[in-house]
């Protein structure tokens, strides 16, 4: 088999026939050096998954539940291409599983016990697996058989396809539990009708159901959605209030050596030639000999899944939690209101050491998880492997786009009620050596630049955003002659100045000596012409305040700030000579962990915060000898956010807009993956 062949897995005679037709028609339109199709027939989707894992086939299209199976070890498959529905201009690759209630009913998600429930059908995704999976640990024990536990949880239900003899309560609202449209409460529209008629109190359906059944907005306004954080929202706010976001139909491949680019090349060309309304001879999204053969008949085309996206991220935390609960059936001993330990994400072994000391001192309240980059940490928080970390504003933006929320802000000024007063922010500045007297904001081209890291506020987003407005392109590595911007591509001129050894060169963590505020300033001291840092960086590393050999003899007077008007000012005049105001660093977490992270961190800062006077003999949460490990070293306290509890509100409209403008220059693979899930 030539290397450019994609071996498609078919699960029936009809699929195999369509696959052969697909193969033959592709041969007729694709040049001989292009991708080709071969067909492999297996007895089931699970057999196809195993065949792909064993390198006997390359691709198959799966529903969400099977994407989960495909991801589990030893299969380790990943999503590579998604089918989309609707229009090319507004492609829908996901649907939202929601819980719909009547507006005046007054209960929340955590008060569903004893209510009457309407389901699309037993074992179906939005109508059963997701809601029951998420409610699993609230069900009365024994939880097996599941139908009995569900019957005992709700006071009555309609769950079409259930066994009405063994579980009569599941058929109480629709006698007989018929498994077809003969049952008026079957399927999406049926479950909604069950709610509408007043038979049930809650209907588990998908987000489009209510729009398909009620054309009139005034009628829709009689209904609300139950959110997982025990609030309610209007039905059109399903993107912010759902049980899970579920991919409709996805092509999977091996994680390693999975031919993902080739599969995309094949399917992209296939949709060009044989997509919706393209050809009479062969139609990719049509099944004359059956239904949904190889691809869904209702699909309109394909979209490439971003490479950073593994199955866990693609399926989303809520969906994975629900399905894992149902499959594994494990719950904490006795669900209590006690907070579980907060799993803090530490960057590389430098932060890990501090985190482990914190963990030991916290006596079980804090646990530590490591990752090599901030983006890897954010991904771990998204999928539940970690719970929280403190982030620069640029990463608060990415985390927010990935569904995380800010929970506490670092405060840098001493005040009486520090914890109650989140600050306006700090200043992003451009520092130069006083001796380089001809250097101004207007003649930085061709100079050597030092950045905290790509994607960070003071070191990247603010200066590069301002620069972008001037040069109108993203080739910052051509603007500066060389530099150190940790997180840049290794072969970029913006890694040339970095000092990390071997694989650590230009890494966005403390293994790279020029990483972070202190690192960027050190880069200026030793090699660079300009450093983009925060207004406190120079005073914190001069006058003997940083005892490291490179810093111990530095003098603040030897450095100056570049002002945007082309002038220069002394370092202490940052208030009148800065690039922009930056939002303070903030702790982020998943929505479901918000309350516990808030509670535990406030306890922890009372034990180990700024009130600890001797940091040589005691653990201090906000100290790490200018290394800014876990938190910035100048943190005085972690402050409540009050109503600034979303990333947009926290960062502010101006900053969100600035980072949004830089999006076209973004190299963030995580941001690309998260905007695929939520454009």
């Amino acid at each position: 088999v030539p290397d450019k062949t994609v071996r498609w897995c078919a699960v029936s005679e009809h699929e195999a026939t369509k696959c052969q037709s697909f193969r033959d028609h592709m041969k007729s339109v694709i040049p001989s050096d292009g991708p080709s199709v071969a067909c492999v027939k297996k007895a089931s989707y699970l057999d196809c998954i195993r065949a792909i894992a064993a390198n006997e086939a390359d691709a198959v299209t799966l529903d969400a539940g099977l994407v989960y199976d495909a991801y589990l070890a030893p299969n380790n498959l990943k999503p590579v291409v998604a089918e989309f529905y609707g229009s090319k201009e507004d492609p829908q690759t996901f649907y939202y599983a929601v819980a719909v209630v009547k507006k005046d009913s007054g209960f929340q998600m955590n008060q569903l016990r004893g209510k009457k429930s309407c389901h699309t059908g037993l074992g179906r995704s939005a109508g059963w697996n997701i809601p029951i999976g998420l409610l699993y640990c609230d069900l009365p024990e024994p939880r097996k058989p599941l139908e009995k536990a569900v019957a005992n949880f709700f006071s009555g239900s309609c769950a079409p396809c259930a066994d009405g003899t063994d579980f009569p309560q599941l058929c109480q609202l629709c006698p007989g539990c018929g498994c077809s449209t003969l049952n008026q409460y079957f399927g999406y529209s049926g479950a909604f009708k069950c709610l509408k008629d007043g038979a049930g109190d809650v209907a588990f359906v998908k987000h489009s159901t209510i729009f398909e059944n009620l054309a009139n907005k005034a009628d829709r306004d009689q209904y609300e959605l139950l959110c997982l954080d025990n609030t309610r929202k209007p039905v059109d706010e399903y993107k912010d209030c759902h049980l899970a976001q579920v991919p409709s139909h996805t092509v999977v491949a091996r994680s390693m050596g999975g031919k993902e680019d080739l599969i995309w090349e094949l399917l992209n060309q296939a949709q060009e030639h044989f997509g919706k309304d393209k050809s009479k001879e062969f139609q990719l999204f049509s099944s004359p000999h059956g239904k949904d053969l190889l691809f869904k008949d209702s699909a309109h085309g394909f979209l490439k899944v971003p490479p950073r996206m593994d199955a866990k991220m693609y399926l989303g935390y809520e969906y994975v939690t629900a399905i894992r609960n149902l499959r594994e059936g494990t719950c904490p001993e006795a669900p209590t209101d006690e907070c579980k330990p907060v799993k803090w994400c530490a960057l590389s072994h430098h932060e890990r050491l501090k985190c482990d000391e914190w963990s030991v001192n916290s006596v079980g309240k804090i646990e530590c998880v490591s990752a090599e980059t901030t983006e890897d940490c954010i991904a771990k928080i998204m999928n539940g492997e970690a719970d929280a970390m403190s982030l620069d504003g640029g990463f608060v933006y990415i985390a927010g786009k990935c569904g995380l929320v800010p929970v506490l802000a670092e405060n840098y000024n001493k005040s009486d009620n520090c914890e109650d007063t989140p600050e306006a922010g700090y200043f992003a500045i451009a520092v130069v050596k006083k001796s380089a007297s001809d250097l101004t904001w207007d003649n930085l081209k061709g100079k050597k630049s030092c950045h905290t890291a790509v994607g960070r506020t003071a070191g990247w987003n603010i200066p590069m955003g301002l620069l972008y407005n001037k040069i109108n392109h993203c080739r910052f590595d051509e603007f500066f002659s060389e530099g150190c911007a940790p997180g840049s591509k290794k072969d970029s001129s913006l890694c040339k100045l970095c000092m990390g050894s071997g694989l650590n060169l230009c890494e966005p963590n403390n293994k790279e000596g020029y990483y972070g505020y202190t690192g960027a300033f050190r880069c200026l001291v030793e090699k660079g012409d300009v450093a983009f840092v925060k207004h406190q960086t120079v005073p914190q590393n001069t006058g003997g305040k940083n005892p490291d050999p490179w810093a111990k003899n530095l003098n603040e007077k030897d450095y100056e700030l570049l002002c945007l008007d082309g002038t220069r000012k002394p370092v202490e005049e940052y208030a009148n000579c800065h690039l922009a105001r930056a939002p303070n660093h903030a702790v982020v977490t998943r929505k479901d962990k918000e309350a516990c992270v808030h509670k535990i961190l406030r306890q922890q800062q009372h034990l180990f915060g700024s009130n600890v006077t001797d940091c040589s003999g005691n653990f201090c949460l906000f100290r790490s000898e200018t290394k800014d490990l876990l938190f910035r070293d100048d943190t005085v306290c972690l402050a409540k956010l009050h109503d600034r509890n979303t990333y947009e509100k926290y960062l502010g409209e101006e900053y969100v807009k600035a980072v949004g403008n830089l999006r076209k220059c973004s190299t963030s693979s995580l941001l690309e993956a998260c905007t695929f899930r939520r454009p």
Epitope: D356, E357, E625
Partner: nanobody, 114 residues
Framework: QVQLVESGGGLVQAGGSLRLSCAAS????????MAWYRQAPGEQRELVAA???????TYADSVKGRFTVSRDNAKDTIDLQMNSLKPEDTGVYYC????????WGQGTQVTVSS
């Protein structure tokens, strides 16, 4: 600055024992937190065992009951006694400490063959 130097690594059969030692270049009495980490190929460094200056001990779940950490302020060492070794204990073992600054050793290789 404190230099940390690990010794005692080597190749051992599953079920066997090794004692790793970490010697500091100066007094460890000012170090609040001393720990042993290990790193398997392609994995993150993970905490194996640690001791605080107040005598609080902690162990990774995977080594509880098999490994013992002991700190000797007089000799300026921290040792890790490893018994009932398993192939999954294989990796580079690093000594680390926190005081006025953070300190790491260069590591010593431990290989447990089955």
């Amino acid at each position: 600055q404190v230099q940390l130097v690990e010794s005692g690594g080597g190749l051992v059969q599953a079920g066997g024992s090794l004692r790793l030692s970490c010697a500091a270049s100066r007094s460890i009495s000012t170090l609040r937190f001393m720990a042993w980490y290990r790193q398997a190929p392609g994995e993150q460094r993970e905490l194996v065992a640690a001791e605080t200056s107040a005598g609080r001990l902690t162990y990774a779940d995977s080594v509880k009951g098999r490994f013992t950490v002991s700190r000797d302020n007089a000799k300026d060492t921290i040792d890790l006694q490893m018994n009932s070794l398993k192939p999954e204990d294989t990796g580079v073992y690093y000594c680390a400490a926190r005081g006025l600054a953070d300190y790491w050793g260069q590591g010593t290789q431990v290989t447990v063959s089955s």
